[in-house]
Structure formats: structure tokens, C-alpha cells
């Protein structure tokens, strides 16, 4: 004969555990039913009566099978720098994430507690490491042969245009100005980060001689909430 299925509440066999979606009630010393997501225990089980469940009230939730006497409170409404990516329902908490142009400076289990605007690199500095959902932009000085003339949280240092004849030499915050009618721009992949080699045909001049190596990490600006550092703006 097949073993008889036990209905909750029931006393578990010594050494065995309760089944899925059941819990062991220490007071009743019985295996009792859990409540489904969106519900909570209104009446705990006894030796002869199973758990009585009730729906979570407005603005409260339970995400898992449970036997809690009270549902959890949904988080407060999302702030103006946030977007609600998941609404508060009886089965899930509200999730707030940062809106575009912002990153999460203080995260919580799900979503973000505190958003901060992404750092903007000022002219002469470009984005070394782009911002993510949870990290700020890192700025770095533009290396010789590259420039950035914008205040931006996305723009990287771009190579100076290569002139046949240079009218105004480029610097970290300004592109070179050519006198010839057809300037050429180097598209070498490494050119964004490294100074441009001078073409034997060009009269391109470097503003100041600097080592032609990529900047060391000491150029990178600190991450996290801090006063605007050199190369970044607070707005």
C-alpha cells in the first residue's frame, strides 16, 4: 500500500523535516502550512488547526512563502532623481533606480537608496572610465595629442586633427587649427589615449614635450561621493 499523505498540521517523523511550503512550528511542534507570496499568517497553527493566511494590506508585501505575522512595508516613493522600475504590489517591493545621468551612490538590497549625478569632465579632461549604474565617471587629463573641449560625463579625449600646416597648435582643451584646406584626422585606435606621432610631412608641433606613455593611474580621479576634483565639475 502507498504511504498515506499527511495533511497539515502533522507531527514530523523524528529526524525528518517538513515538506516544501511547510514550516516546523516550535510551539505546536507540528509541520504547518506556509502562506503564499502576497499573504501573511493571520492565525498560527495549533495541533489540530492549520495556519490561517490573509492578504497583505495596501503598501505591504511578502515576496516568499512565509509564516510572518505581518507583511513587510513597501519602500517609500521614488525620489525625483529616480525612476520606479518595479511598483509596490502585494508580492513585491517597490524598486527605484537612478534616472539617466545619475548613478547609485548608496545601494540597497534591491534598487537604490541614494542617487548622485554623474561627474562631468571639464575641458582638458576626458572620461577614463564611464559611469555605470553603481559607479561614478572617472576623468583623466587628455594626453598630448588629444583634447576635450566639452564639459561632459560621456566625452573621451579625442585626437587632434593632423594638419599639413598648423595655424594654432592643439592643446588638452582645444583641437589644432589648420591652415590647409583639407585636414586629416588620425583614426588610429590608440590615438585616443596616446600622443600622435608627428608625420614627417606635417608641420604639427606639440604644445609642450611630454613622455609619450599613457598616464599612470595616479592621474585617475577618486571615485565615490567627494567634492569636485581637478578635471571635474560639480554640476
Amino acid at each position: 500500500l502507498p504511504a498515506q499523505v499527511a495533511f497539515t498540521p502533522y507531527a514530523p517523523e523524528p529526524g525528518s523535516t517538513c515538506r516544501l511550503r511547510e514550516y516546523y512550528d516550535q510551539t505546536a511542534q507540528m509541520c504547518c502550512s506556509k502562506c503564499s507570496p502576497g499573504q501573511h499568517a493571520k492565525v498560527f497553527c495549533t495541533k489540530t488547526s492549520d495556519t490561517v493566511c490573509d492578504s497583505c494590506e495596501d503598501s505591504t508585501y511578502t515576496q516568499l512563502w512565509n509564516w510572518v505575522p505581518e507583511c513587510l512595508s513597501c519602500g517609500s516613493r521614488c525620489s525625483s532623481d529616480q525612476v520606479e522600475t518595479q511598483a509596490c504590489t502585494r508580492e513585491q517591493n517597490r524598486i527605484c533606480t537612478c534616472r539617466p545621468g545619475w548613478y547609485c551612490a548608496l545601494s540597497k538590497q534591491e534598487g537604490c537608496r541614494l542617487c548622485a549625478p554623474l561627474r562631468k569632465c571639464r575641458p582638458g579632461f576626458g572620461v577614463a572610465r564611464p559611469g555605470t549604474e553603481t559607479s561614478d565617471v572617472v576623468c583623466k587629463p587628455c594626453a598630448p595629442g588629444t583634447f576635450s573641449n566639452t564639459t561632459s560625463s560621456t566625452d573621451i579625449c579625442r585626437p587632434h586633427q593632423i594638419c599639413n600646416v598648423v595655424a594654432i597648435p592643439g592643446n588638452a582643451s582645444m583641437d589644432a587649427v589648420c591652415t590647409s584646406t583639407s585636414p586629416t584626422r588620425s583614426m588610429a585606435p590608440g590615438a585616443v589615449h596616446l600622443p600622435q606621432p608627428v608625420s614627417t610631412r606635417s608641420q604639427h608641433t606639440q604644445p609642450t614635450p611630454e613622455p609619450s606613455t599613457a598616464p599612470s593611474t595616479s592621474f585617475l580621479l577618486p571615485m565615490g561621493p567627494s567634492p569636485p576634483a581637478e578635471g571635474s565639475t560639480g554640476d
Partner: antibody
Framework: QVTLKESGPGILQPSQTLSLTCSFS??????????VGWIRQPSGKGLEWLAH???????FYNPSLKSQLTISKDTSRNQVFLKLTSVVTADTATYYC???????????WGQGTTLTVSS | DVQMTQSPSSLSASLGGKVTITCKAS??????IAWYQHKPGKGPRLLIH???TLQPGIPSKFSGSGSGRDYSFSISNLEPEDIATYYC????????FGGGTKLEIT
């Protein structure tokens, strides 16, 4: 309005049996999740849970006094009874009855009845 | 059985001040703790259940917190009517009261 009131003999001699009654109003023991329990407080000491009974007649007793205690109810008369056999002087105390919620804490209490055990 | 160690057993505080009482359980009680105020000649009065939920009608000057085995209860802005003995009750595994804390106000 929930109210509970305890009544008892006041004075007993050692070895006698204590019989207490809790009469309540404002709720019914036929309602799912309702329970009534007994707690005592010896003079100058703390509170001690003794026993309680649920709407479905499930009963719980303090393990250290289980052999001496019996709890019962009369649902239609809104009463719960407690018997404690073979009393000793250490059972001198104020005895309280209290309502239990479905999630097992005591939310309403009576004012208590005093028992003195003396020869 | 679950034992509840309540401390201090007595304390004195000044009007308008704040006091904190702690209860330590001998095992995890899953936040199933209640706090009561008890005055002579009356039955205990429920203040807080499930660690931090205020009973309806109880002022927010009373608060509770904790998890696992360690729980605390605070009263702020002390008034003369707060003079009483306070008890914790664990109801996660049968029922056990703490030893009580007698509060005096100076």
C-alpha cells in the same frame, strides 16, 4: 470592548486544589485564532506563564507545572477554567487571565485575583 | 525552554530623558517578542508586539528593535506616568517572560 475578570477562592491550605475562573466579554472562543491563557505573579517577583487554551480546544501547559495543571473552557458561557492541584505556599500569587491573539501574544489582561496558600 | 534575561532589573532616570531595556533570549525567537507595562493593582498593558509593532493607542515614545536573540525596548521623553515595571515576553517557542525592569523617575 474586550474585558476579562478572574475569580478564585482567595485563601487555600497546602495540598488543596486551586480552581480559577476567567469570565470574558468582547470576543468569543468560537472564533478562529482566539485563545485565553493564565499567568501568575508571586508577590515581589516576575510574571510566569501557566497555561492556555485555543478556540479549537488545543491546550498548552508550562512544562514545569504540566502534571498539576488542567485548563478547560465553556465557549457558550465565555469562561475559561484553570485547576492547579496540590498547592504549596510557593503558589501564593496574583493570578491573571489574558486573551491570546492568533499570532500568540497576550493583548488584553484581567486585573488579577490574589491567592494566599497558608496553613 | 527558552530563557529570557532582562536587564537592568531596575533603573532611575530623569523627566524628559530616555531609557533602554534589553532582553536576551537563550535561542533565536524570530522577532516574536512583546513588551508590557505593569502598574500595581492592574493587569499588564501591551505596548509592542512582534519586536517593533506599536499596539493601537500606544504613543510613539515607546519603541522596540532587535532580531535573533537580542532585543531592546526604549522609552523617550519620560513622564511621571511611565513609572512602572516593564516586562518582555517571548512567544516564539511557548511563552516566557523576562524578569522585569522597575523604572523610577527622579
Amino acid at each position: 470592548q474586550v474585558t476579562l475578570k478572574e475569580s478564585g477562592p482567595g485563601i487555600l491550605q497546602p495540598s488543596q486544589t486551586l480552581s480559577l475562573t476567567c469570565s470574558f466579554s468582547g470576543f468569543s472562543l468560537s472564533t478562529s485564532g482566539m485563545g485565553v491563557g493564565w499567568i501568575r505573579q508571586p508577590s515581589g517577583k516576575g510574571l510566569e506563564w501557566l497555561a492556555h487554551i485555543w478556540w479549537d480546544d488545543d491546550k498548552f501547559y508550562n512544562p514545569s507545572l504540566k502534571s498539576q495543571l488542567t485548563i478547560s473552557k465553556d465557549t457558550s458561557r465565555n469562561q475559561v477554567f484553570l485547576k492547579l492541584t496540590s498547592v504549596v505556599t510557593a503558589d501564593t500569587a496574583t493570578y491573571y487571565c489574558a486573551r491570546l491573539t492568533g499570532t500568540r501574544y497576550f493583548d488584553y489582561w484581567g486585573q488579577g485575583t490574589t491567592l494566599t496558600v497558608s496553613s | 525552554d527558552v530563557q529570557m534575561t532582562q536587564s537592568p532589573s531596575s533603573l532611575s532616570a530623569s523627566l524628559g530623558g530616555k531609557v533602554t531595556i534589553t532582553c536576551k533570549a537563550s535561542q533565536d525567537i524570530n522577532k516574536f517578542i512583546a513588551w508590557y507595562q505593569h502598574k500595581p493593582g492592574k493587569g499588564p498593558r501591551l505596548l509592542i508586539h512582534y519586536t517593533s509593532t506599536l499596539q493601537p493607542g500606544i504613543p510613539s515614545k515607546f519603541s522596540g528593535s532587535g532580531s535573533g536573540r537580542d532585543y531592546s525596548f526604549s522609552i523617550s521623553n519620560l513622564e511621571p506616568e511611565d513609572i512602572a515595571t516593564y516586562y518582555c515576553l517571548q512567544y516564539g517557542n511557548l511563552w516566557t517572560f523576562g524578569g522585569g525592569t522597575k523604572l523610577e523617575i527622579t
